[in-house]
Structures are given as C-alpha cells and as structure tokens.
Amino acid sequence: EEELQVIQPDKSVLVAAGETATLRCTATSLIPVGPIQWFRGAGPGRELIYNQKEGHFPRVTTVSDLTKRNNMDFSIRIGNITPADAGTYYCVKFRKGSPDDVEFKSGAGTELSVRAKPSAPVVSGPAARATPQHTVSFTCESHGFSPRDITLKWFKNGNELSDFQTNVDPVGESVSYSIHSTAKVVLTREDVHSQVICEVAHVTLQGDPLRGTANLSETIRVPPTLEVTQQPVRAENQVNVTCQVRKFYPQRLQLTWLENGNVSRTETASTVTENKDGTYNWMSWLLVNVSAHRDDVKLTCQVEHDGQPAVSKSHDLKVSAHPKEQGSNTAAENTGSNERNIY
C-alpha cells in the first residue's frame, strides 16, 4: 500500500473580510490511523487552528464528517474572516502515538489572503483658518485594507490635484495596511463653496471608490473690504455716514464706529447678505448731528473679523454751514444697520 500523502490542492485562497474561508485538504489513505490538525504557519511557533480530537474551535467547521470510516476529506471552513487570519495554513496528518500523537505528513500549505475594504477616508484640514493666496495642507487617512495595492487621488471641485504625497504603511508584509496622504491647496477668494475630496480606489471596492471630503468653508478666511461714504443730508443738521463691509467669510464680525478716535458704537454683524461665492456683505450707518460740532469730524469704521486684528477705514466729515454730499451709496445692502444720532 502506498504511503499516505496529504494534498492541499489550493496554493492560495483569497477571501473578503467577514466571509468564510474554505481550506481544502485530502489524504490518499486511511492508514495510519490518527487525527488531522490544521496549523497557521510552520515550525515551533505555529498556531493551532483546528484539532480533530481535542479543543474547542468555534470558528472552524469541517466540510465533511471526519468520523466516517472512509472519509479522507479533511477540509475546513473558517468563519468571519478578518485580516488577522491571513497566513499559510497547513493540513497535518498525525498518527496515533504515545505519549502524544506523532506528526506524520504535512500538506504543502495554502496561503490565505484576506481582502479587506479600506475604512472611509477621513480628510482633515489645518487647525487654523488661512486667507486667500496661502497654501494649506489637507491630510487623508484610510485604514485596515488588504491587499496593499491602493490608489489615492485628490480633487478640488472636481479638478484633480497633483501636489500631494502618499505613504502606505507598513512597508513590509502585514495583515492589513493604512494609507496617509497630504495634499497642498492654494486658497482663492472664491473657495468658500469649494470642496477638497480624497478618493480611494481598492480591489475590494469593485470600481466604486470611497471618498472623504473637506469643505474649504472650514479652512478659509476671506477678510472684508471696507468702504466709508457720506450720504445725502437727511435733515438740515444731520449727515448719514455708511460703512460697507464687503466679501468677508466667516460671518463672525464686530464693527466699531469711532468719532475723532472715541468709540461711539459697537455692533455685531447679524443680518448679512450672502453673495453667490458664499462670502457676506454687511452695512452699518451712522447719523451725525453736525450742528453739535464746531470742527471737522474724523469718523472711523473699525472692523474686527473672526478674531483677527482690526482693520479700519476713516472718513473726514467737513463741518460747514451747508453740508454737501460727499459720496453716493450705490449698494442697497442697508438691512440690519442701526441708526444713531451723535449729540
């Protein structure tokens, strides 16, 4: 009778995480009597996966009934596969012996590779806001995928970016991998509505890549432009001065009126108008009673935007017997402004 051989017909098996792996093994003879054991890895550090005779292996089931007389199929199924299960599995025939069963013949091994999907990419931007023309960095991370091959792309508003660096870790063999990429993006004033997208393509995703997004509205700060104008006379002794705060983002803004350097009023932007590009406009006005002044008045509109140092714009108000119109306001955004008389 020919000596028993242990046959593992599959050199490799590829299984998706969460699925069941079938590891095939047959013997060519029933002799000698003794159990089959499955191990992951070889040598003294090998890990016991299944012992036909002793132990409890809840994730493992046998394909056929190993107790049947003529059974020579020692294939097993391992349920709920994770990347940690990857490795080479050996079907090993033991013959009964004392004090322990004696290893008799091993199969050639089956390499189990686990296909694991990458986690949803997480995109994070800089901790602090930046202004247009500045370059900011965005990072994208995805974890737990296998095999190692993966493709990552960056987009801004649908346009592919080229200035980025990507690393896949670890460099050597591992049960699963992580990807980390950093992209550089130059901000423009129009980026309030812009999105940065990190797209990850992997064999497990069947052509449907995963995307992570970051809204540049979380990153950009567009500083306002200020314009102070004197409006037509409302009454014989009153002048209306407006401060137009244009194209700012985010909305957090505080405006202070100064009269000859002295604070006359402070207000917070509330009812703003939104421009198509996502920036905001706001207008504040001040009613100045010129009869209360003998000298010229310097009016200053001082704006503190998003916690940044204040910017200001001044207007010299000439005090004369007949105040003249010093400018015209073509903007209609005067909602939410406050009237204030200076006495």
């Epitope: 029933l30 002799i31 009597v33 003794g34 107790t67 009964k96």
Partner: antibody, heavy 120, light 107 residues
Framework: EVQLQQSGPELVKPGASVKMSCKAS????????MHWVKQKPGQGLEWIGY????????KYNEKFKGKATLTSDKSSSTAYMELSSLTSEDSAVYYC?????????????WGQGTTLTVSS | DIVMTQSHKFMSTSVGDRVSITCKAS??????VAWYQQKSGQSPKLLIY???YRYTGDPDRFTGSGSGTDFTFTISSVQAEDLAVYYC?????????FGGGTKLEIK
C-alpha cells in the same frame, strides 16, 4: 494523562444483571470511542462492542447482542456496560478500551479491568 | 468473522535473541493489524497498529510487518521484561477479532 478507571470486582448470581463503569479522564471524552473487551481466565480476547459518546452510536459483536448494553454519560465522562441473564460463561475480566474513531479497531488505552464472577 | 491465527501458542527465547511471532488472517485485511503485549495480571498494551506503526517511540526493538493475510511481529533483541503474551488483532472490519495469543518465555 489519559486514564480509564473501571469499577471494582463483581460477584453475582446466575440470572442476575450487572452494570460496570469506566470513567475516562485526561482527554475529551466525546472525541474518542469506547470499546469493551472480554477475557476469560487464561484465554484470549473477545471484542464485545463500542459506544461513541459523541452521538451515543453503538455497534455490537453479534455474539453479544442481547447480552451487553452499552451506554455513556457525557457529563461524568463515564461509559457503562450492563450484562444481563448472567451465566458462568460470563465470568471473565472485562476491559474498556479507547480508540480514535468508530472505524478504528486498535485500542491505545485500556482500563485495568473489572473481574466478574458469576456463581451461585 | 475474520479469524486471526497465531500458530505458536508458546515461543521460547533467550535474552538478546531476535524473535518473530507470526499471525495469519482468514481473509485480506490490507495492513489493518495491531499487536498487543499483555503481561501477567495486567491489561493489554498497544505496541503496533496498521501492521507497522509503532505506537510508542520506545522501545524501538519492537517492529511489525506484513500485509494482506500474513503478518509478523519481531523483537530484535529480547529483554527479560518482554516476558508476556502477544496478541495480533485485525482492525479491518467489525467484529474486531484477536489471535489466540503467543506466550513468550525466556529460557
């Protein structure tokens, strides 16, 4: 260490019944098959039958059908053999012995034996 | 039932000698034959199964051979402690059957 501990000697009258036990330790009781073997004084060995504790499946030597009944108790890892309608021909040493499978007839561990004497 | 015949009920040998015990099956049992040693007052002990596989690593002076219907158990160098009855048994099909035994006596 694998051990099969059998119950003590029995002296019974003809026509009576006897139930002997074999307590297994040192291995997973339900993963192996338990056989019973008879040896009359100064004679050879005779296989009586087996029980598979995993599924309580039994197989008997035709010669011992109706004479021997094999049972097992998983909770105590104990196999039992009951012999009925005893005669002097049943006087013998009875061994329990373990094998790997129900199709494996080579017995790697044996109990120390239970001596049965049938006498009036 | 398969009948296993051990032609020698007794065999006499000396310490250090090589001795062979034979067993014949009434039909082909392939290599499904086991050999047991039973010392006086003790339980049988498995030495060889599947005709040639030694159950315990030691002593390696015990060997088995044969297939089909003719089988041999050999002690390469008999020791005093080998005094015992040796049984062959077929484990090819039920009912498992034993030979009548060969008693090894030391001169």
């Amino acid at each position: 260490e694998v051990q099969l501990q059998q119950s003590g000697p029995e002296l019974v009258k003809p026509g009576a019944s006897v139930k002997m036990s074999c307590k297994a330790s040192g291995y997973t009781f339900t993963s192996y098959v338990m056989h019973w073997v008879k040896q009359k004084p100064g004679q050879g060995l005779e296989w009586i039958g087996y029980i598979n504790p995993y599924n309580d499946g039994t197989k008997y030597n035709e010669k011992f059908k109706g004479k021997a009944t094999l049972t097992s108790d998983k909770s105590s890892s104990t196999a039992y053999m009951e012999l009925s309608s005893l005669t002097s021909e049943d006087s013998a040493v009875y061994y329990c012995a373990r094998s790997y499978y129900d199709y494996d007839g080579s017995f790697d561990y044996w109990g120390q034996g239970t001596t049965l004497t049938v006498s009036s | 039932d398969i009948v296993m015949t051990q032609s020698h009920k007794f065999m006499s040998t000396s310490v250090g000698d090589r001795v062979s015990i034979t067993c014949k099956a009434s039909q082909d049992v392939t290599t499904a034959v086991a050999w047991y040693q039973q010392k006086s007052g003790q339980s049988p002990k498995l030495l060889i199964y599947s005709a040639s596989y030694r159950y315990t690593g030691d002593p390696d002076r015990f060997t088995g051979s044969g297939s089909g219907t003719d089988f041999t158990f050999t002690i390469s160098s008999v020791q005093a402690e080998d005094l015992a009855v040796y049984y062959c048994q077929q484990h090819y099909s039920t009912p498992w059957t034993f030979g009548g035994g060969t008693k090894l006596e030391i001169k």
